[in-house]
């Protein structure tokens, strides 16, 4: 995915008192945007 | 590789818990929003529940039909997230499915029945 | 919650031909910085699910641009421009804009 999913705040609005945001972030913090961003940690040697 | 591989999956009686363990390793897993999601035996798919990253507090999110009963948690040091399931109902019986919406993992099944 | 109905519920094509699926919501899909929260996924038999357009007409990483999105605010379109063999299984649409976030019932695609 070039912009993979958007999480952003579909949905702070169960809490009570708290906005509706209507915003969907998924994307920017999805799996494949990670990926993108973040270099994988060497995996550990034996 | 992306890999998220589901464990803990079995067959309970209702009223009883399990704890199901979504293991990830391929990608830098701290900011990365999660979720469970299942699929009931007539194919539909429910969201059930969802966590965010340290950065949004780990705030949680969940499905009317698991609320109060379902919890999610995730360990970053482990790159790992969990579904601990308790008061288990006959209708919980599904494949649960640990995801991030642009990879899944394979499934785990759990069965509720007496 | 916002209920997303899906049309038809299974279609038979032929290979080669083109074939759409429709997904309604009850509400409106388009969040703040004009983005649409709808988003289309395949099942595949015996496999899990795979994302394959996101916000409305974004194509998936390695999915082929036979798949196309499109919509309004609250009717969406999946096209399928040419069938191919492995494109059976079900399409579900889905929405993660408001929670608790819901997917449609899915449409089962099979070929003539």
């Known amino acids: 995915l070039a912009d993979p999913l958007d999480h952003r705040d579909a949905g702070d609005l169960w809490v009570p008192g708290e906005s509706e945001s209507f915003e969907d972030a998924h994307v920017e913090h999805s799996i494949s945007r990670s990926l993108l961003e973040g270099e994988i940690p060497f995996p550990p040697t034996s | 590789e992306v890999q998220l591989v589901e464990t803990g999956g079995s067959l309970v009686q209702p009223g009883k818990s399990l704890k199901l363990t979504c293991a990830t390793s391929?990608?830098?897993?701290?900011?990365?929003?999660m979720h469970w999601v299942r699929q009931s035996p007539e194919k539909q798919l429910e969201w059930i529940a969802h966590i965010k990253a340290k950065s949004d507090n780990y705030a949680t999110y969940y499905a009317e039909s698991v609320k109060g009963r379902f919890t999610i948690s995730r360990d970053d040091s482990k790159t790992s997230i969990y579904l601990q399931m308790n008061s288990l109902k006959d209708d919980d019986t599904a494949i649960y499915y640990c995801t991030g919406l642009d990879y899944w993992g394979q499934g785990v099944m759990v069965t509720v029945s007496s | 919650d916002t209920v997303l109905t899906q049309a038809p519920l299974s279609v038979s094509v032929t290979p080669g031909e083109s074939a759409s699926i429709s997904c309604r919501s009850n509400k409106s899909l388009l969040g703040i910085r004009d983005i649409t929260s709808l988003y289309w996924f395949l099942q595949k038999p015996g496999k899990s699910p795979q994302l394959l357009i996101y916000?409305?007409?974004n194509l998936a990483s390695g999915v082929p641009d036979r798949f196309s999105g499109s919509g309004s605010e609250t009717d969406f379109t999946l096209k399928i421009s040419e069938v191919e063999t492995e494109d059976v299984g079900v399409y579900y649409c889905a929405q993660f804009l408001r929670y608790p976030y819901t997917f449609g019932p899915g449409t089962k695609l099979e070929l003539q």
């Open positions: 391929g990608f830098p897993f701290s900011n990365v929003w």
């Open positions: 916000r409305m007409s």
